[in-house]
Every structure is written in C-alpha cells, then in structure tokens.
Interface confidence: low
Amino acid sequence: MRTEAQVPALQPPEPGLEGAMGHRTLVLPWVLLTLCVTAGTPEVWVQVRMEATELSSFTIRCGFLGSGSISLVTVSWGGPNGAGGTTLAVLHPERGIRQWAPARQARWETQSSISLILEGSGASSPCANTTFCCKFASFPEGSWEACGSLPPSSDPGLSAPPTPAPILRADLAGILGVSGVLLFGCVYLLHLLRRHKHRPAPRLQPSRTSPQAPRARAWAPSQASQAALHVPYATINTSCRPATLDTAHPHGGPSWWASLPTHAAHRPQGPAAWASTPIPARGSFVSVENGLYAQAGERPPHTGPGLTLFPDPRGPRAMEGPLGVR
C-alpha cells in the first residue's frame, strides 16, 4: 500500500482566471489550508456550484480520501440518505451508474471522486439552498457521508467556499494523515500567508455547529473563490426541501431496478436502467496508510463499458457479483 497523502485535485480553472494575481499562488495556500485543517480525519468532500449558463442547474462534486476500496457512492438531496434525503444517483465502481430526475449526468471523475449535474427545470428542480449529500461506502472502513449546499448569496458560476466541518454521520475513527508532508505543508502555508498579507483572503471562524473544526466564512466573488477547492466536510444545513420526485423513493432510497435482460425471473419494473458509462482507470489512487487495515494492492480498473447487471427486488445489494463482474 502506498503511503503518500492524496491531495484533493483542483477544479479546472474558470475561463479568464489567468489574471495578474497569479492563479497558482492563490490556489496553493488553500490546498494546504484544507490539508492542515482536516489532517488526521477521514475525508469526504462535497462541492456544490450553480452553473452560470443555466441558473437553476447545479453541479455536485464529491470525493473520498481513505485507504479502503470504494464500493458505492450515493448522492442525495434534502438531507442525508436514509434520513429524509432523496436519492439522486448511485455509482458503483464496476457495475455502473444509476440516476433519477432531475439528475442529468452522473459520472466518475477519478476513482475516488464523482460529479453529478442536475437539471434545473420542472417541479423537482433544486432551489439555491438545497442540501446535497454524498455517501461513500468503503471496504472495510464503513460508510461516510458529507453534505453541502450553495451559500444563499452565491453568484451563478461560483462554487461553495471551503467549509471544513466534521460530519455528524462519520462513523469511524480518523484515518491517519502523512504527518511529514502535512507539517511541511502547514509551515509552507504560514510562510505564504506572511508573504501575501496584503491580499484579501477568506477569514476562518469557529463553527457554531461544532467546536471541533473551523468553518470558513463565505466571501465575495474573487479569483480565489472561483478557483475553489474540493472541500472536505462541507456540512451546511438548509431549510429548503426539494419537491417530490416523479419516481418516489421509499425510505429515502431509490425505487430500484429496471427490467433488464437477465437470467433471473420475476423482476419488478424500476424507473431507469443503469448507464453503461465506462469507469475511468483506477491506477492513480494514492491511499493513506491506516494501521487498522490489512495492507493490500489497488483495485484493478474496470475497463469495459459493458456491465452485466442482475436486477433484484431487493435492490442493488442483491445483484450477482458484489465487487463487480470481472
């Protein structure tokens, strides 16, 4: 098992951001700040942004930094999945992707991060302060969930600012960081901050909801905020609830399973079929060493788009081939 710390990848720079202030110089401190704030904890990050071109269209991006194998990602809105939230998409590393309106496109960005684009029309369209949650099931670490939303005053095209805070539903002790790298990063961050005192930057303030970690204050649109990070532990509670979807999901989960070609008989109809989206190669994963778990190699990539699926009334858990049909 490799022991380097995985640094959250940066979002591609916005058009026209290559300004005089220096894109790279602005971004690096916030990467390091994110690392310093969240060092030593399992990291799930959520980023929500409203598209500038379609004001009611949202992009949700989520990622997981841990040492286990991701076995499932569930994206929900209106609250955590299973606690009042409604499932928007389910992504399995080998078996494919399912999504429900108003989700337009769910996909893997890397082997440990996903993105979801939501349509912005109709009764089920999200409102600006809807909470979106991402839940990662990792073997054997268990399940981790983080939630996030756009600040009410966000301008279109902007991402939610970094808002590190502990997840209420995080059920496992912290995953160990790589202290040497982080220590160097934090020292370097302080050095950078001292050099760039004259530049406006977001100020950290203690979170009112949790004394354990700081929460960043939203700031005015700037090049720094537009070059936003993937943010661990974005938990912003909102009062806005989405309209009920056309395909109802009892217990906050999806009404599973389309009628697909299968050897199994008597399967119920479901709202949609799995998308046979090719899964990106998984060779770039860098894991954090965790003394709790057995050392093991990386999961090999699933290279083909053809996914053999076996729907079952019990839902996705019952499909043949728990870790993917290889």
């Epitope: 499932l72 054997p140 399940s143 969930e145 059920d171 858990r317 019952a318 728990p322 870790l323 993917g324």
Partner: antibody
Framework: EVQLVESGGGLVKPGGSLKLSCAAS????????MSWVRQTPAKRLEWVAT????????YYPDTVKGRFTISRDNAKNTLYLQMRSLRSEDTAMYYC?????????????WGQGTSVTVSS | QIVLTQSPAIMSASPGEKVTMTCSAS?????LYWYQQKPGSSPRLLIY???NLASGVPVRFSGSGSGTSYSLTLSRMEAEDAATYYC?????????FGAGTKLELK
Amino acid sequence: EVQLVESGGGLVKPGGSLKLSCAASGFTFSSYAMSWVRQTPAKRLEWVATITSGDIRTYYPDTVKGRFTISRDNAKNTLYLQMRSLRSEDTAMYYCVGHDDFHFYAMDYWGQGTSVTVSS
Amino acid sequence: QIVLTQSPAIMSASPGEKVTMTCSASSSVSYLYWYQQKPGSSPRLLIYDTSNLASGVPVRFSGSGSGTSYSLTLSRMEAEDAATYYCQQWSSYPLTFGAGTKLELK
C-alpha cells in the same frame, strides 16, 4: 440454488492449528466477497475474517489478526480459513458467508457451519 | 468498536400479536442489518440497510431507525417466526453483531 458447505472442523488442542474449507456453488463465487463468521457456545455471532473478490483484500478483527488467514481459490470455488495458535475462546461453530457488498455489507448466503472445539 | 445492545433478550408473543425489538448502538451507525436464526439452522438475512426486506422475507417484517436506535417490527406474529434475531453493523470497523433477541411463541 446457492450452497456453501463448510468442512475441516474438529477437536484441537490449544496452540494447535486447523484449516477450514468452504465449497461454494450456485452463484458466481469469484465475484463475491466472502467471510467467516463464528457462533460461540453462548450463541454470540462474531465476525472472523473477510476476503474481497478480484483484488483479494483481506480483513480481520484484532481478536484473530496474525493467527487466522483467510484465502480463496476461485478456480475451485473454495474459501479457506487457516487457524493457528488456537485458543479455547476460538471454540465455536464457524460459518462460511457470501456477502454482496454492492450496497453495504450484509451477509446474504450462509453455510451450515462446521464445529471447532479447542480443548486440552 | 461499536457495541450493539439488543433488547429484550427474550420475549414471547401470541400468534397475530405485534412484536417490536430494538437494537441500540454505542455510537452512531449508518445502516443496520437484521438476521433470523431458527434452532438448528444458520442465520438468514432478514433486513438490509435498516429497512429493506431481503429476498423471500414476508412483508410482515419491517425495520426502521437511525443513528444509535434501530428496531425490528413484526406486524403479526406467526409460529414460524419463533427464532433468535440478531442485528449487525458495518458502519465502523470491525463488523459487530448484537447478542440477539430470542422470540418465543406464547
């Protein structure tokens, strides 16, 4: 029909070794994560080990780590549990379990169990 | 590790009676599983992910709960339901089971 048939149990002295086997049929064995779960004489269920499919990762609770080794032979559709340095508290009925981790980690298929008694 | 405490340890119910048993976790868990074990048999998956019925399980069984408090409800007791019921979690390493609730037919 899914079938998991355990074998290899028996009476062994403390400090001894034993190797359990589990023959699987009726499902795509190579695609399933597999576990061993034991049930003590007091009827408590205890997770013993898990092995994933494909990348063959193995996981153990601290109580057996370093003493027990789970392995699989996908060509033979067989799961194994090598037990060393056995203790009296390892006395139990050992179940071979197939579990679909697609949604999380419930255990779908259970064998009938094989009894292990550690006693001098 | 997360300790699951099931209560009551033993209970009895008459045919047609509604039965509820609980599983309390020492720390918050995301999902819970329930198994049924009849005398002389292996455990059988009953409910997965807190509230979803496994294949072939009668609809009189239902599961609910969140956080640290979960329950298994049997809407109408039948003779074949006499068994021991175990809860299990894997929200946190290691996987753990409850000690079980023995349901007897009155």
